[in-house]
């Protein structure tokens, strides 16, 4: 039985050229996290954090993605094309798979504020 819940940063905004931290947090379960996958809106993998081997950033994103903090992911040098959905997928044992969603809006405006409240989707 899957008892856990994924908390995410929910809907966030950041300005073009800036950076943003995508965060998910798995709670209410004692399951062991074996791997966390980070995917973009088009389902392309950005990064994997494997419990044994650590982080692997996929080639297309190596220049703009940094691992962490924690199980999160830092996107840098944001462009308007980065607007969209991002998904964290927690592979756990014995529970199985948990998935969280974050919506990122990249704004042209220099007054764009980064909101980072945690939400349960």
């Amino acid at each position: 039985m899957m008892t856990g819940t994924i908390e995410t940063t929910g809907n966030i905004s950041a300005k073009k050229g800036g950076s943003v931290i995508l965060q998910c947090h798995l709670s209410s379960t004692m399951a062991q996290v074996t791997q966390v996958n980070w995917e973009q809106h088009d389902h392309s993998l950005l990064a994997i954090r494997n419990a044994e081997l650590g982080w692997h950033i996929y080639p297309a994103f190596k220049d703009r993605v940094a691992p962490g903090p924690g199980l999160g992911l830092t996107l840098q040098s944001l462009t308007m094309n980065d607007t969209g959905e991002y998904f964290c997928t927690y592979h756990t044992y014995p529970d199985g798979t948990y998935r969280g969603r974050i919506f990122l809006e990249v704004l042209e405006s220099s007054v764009a504020e980064h909101s980072a409240r945690f939400q349960i989707p």
């Epitope: 791997q35 994997i48 494997n50 419990a51 044994e52 081997l53 650590g54 982080w55 692997h56 950033i57 940094a66 691992p67 962490g68």
Partner: antibody, heavy 121, light 107 residues
């Protein structure tokens, strides 16, 4: 005693293939990620590839991606590196190493004695 | 990829000297930093893991410090058997990159 013993090195022509083996003893092989690291003559250390304990996750250096394949047989306590389309720049001493172990922040704590691969016509 | 820059590339020291080697990562790697010692014709040996944890069996004259991007390996009192090449390596993310090495030679 924890031990790693490499074999399979030798002289091969450019474009040729070799398979390196690494026999492990003295620890529970299947619970540890394993790596291959190489050292060209007179040069520093270069990580080549790593594999998770189950063999389900594998990663490679860009310099060998698509040409080398890491694998393991946990029933035989053996790690392998299949090297195809070999180039002169692959000439090096190849070491197998236990680790790293991300969740413990542990490095490569046991190394084999190394096996020499020479690619030359 | 995370670049690891070691300095100096070589140094000359005498037995009993205090020796310091530095390693800088191109981005934060928290404490996922290891130090290795290698002697000619031999395999590398893990000295320090997690930036400051001494590997079992390694003499206490070796110590490591640092977090984020800047790290240090210190040998408090150099012994004859310590003349070797030292490498730092990050294990936060693949590819697990090594520094270029520091050769510690006898003065």
């Amino acid at each position: 005693e924890v031990q790693l013993l490499e074999s399979g090195g030798g002289l091969v022509q450019p474009g040729g293939s070799l398979r390196l083996s690494c026999a492990a003893s003295g620890f529970t092989f299947s619970t540890y990620a394993m790596s291959w690291v190489r050292q060209a003559p007179g040069k520093g250390l270069e990580w080549v590839s790593a594999i998770s304990g189950s063999g389900g996750s594998t990663y490679y250096a860009d310099s060998v991606k698509g040409r080398f394949t890491i694998s393991r047989d946990n029933s035989k306590n053996t790690l392998y590196l299949q090297m195809n389309s070999l180039r002169a720049e692959d000439t090096a001493v190849y070491y197998c190493a236990k680790g790293p172990r991300y969740q413990d922040r542990a490095g490569m704590d046991v190394w084999g004695q190394g096996t020499t691969v020479t690619v030359s016509s | 990829d995370i670049q690891m820059t070691q300095s100096p590339s070589s140094l000359s020291a005498s037995v009993g000297d205090r020796v310091t080697i530095t390693c800088r990562a191109s981005q934060s790697i928290s404490s996922y930093l290891n130090w290795y010692q290698q002697k000619p014709g031999k395999a590398p040996k893990l000295l320090i893991y997690a930036a400051s944890s001494l590997q079992s069996g390694v003499p206490s004259r070796f110590s490591g410090s640092g977090s984020g991007t800047d790290f240090t390996l210190t040998i408090s009192s150099l012994q004859p058997e310590d003349f070797a090449t030292y490498y730092c390596q990050q294990s936060l993310a693949t590819p697990y990159t090594f520094g270029g090495g520091t050769k510690v030679e006898i003065k």
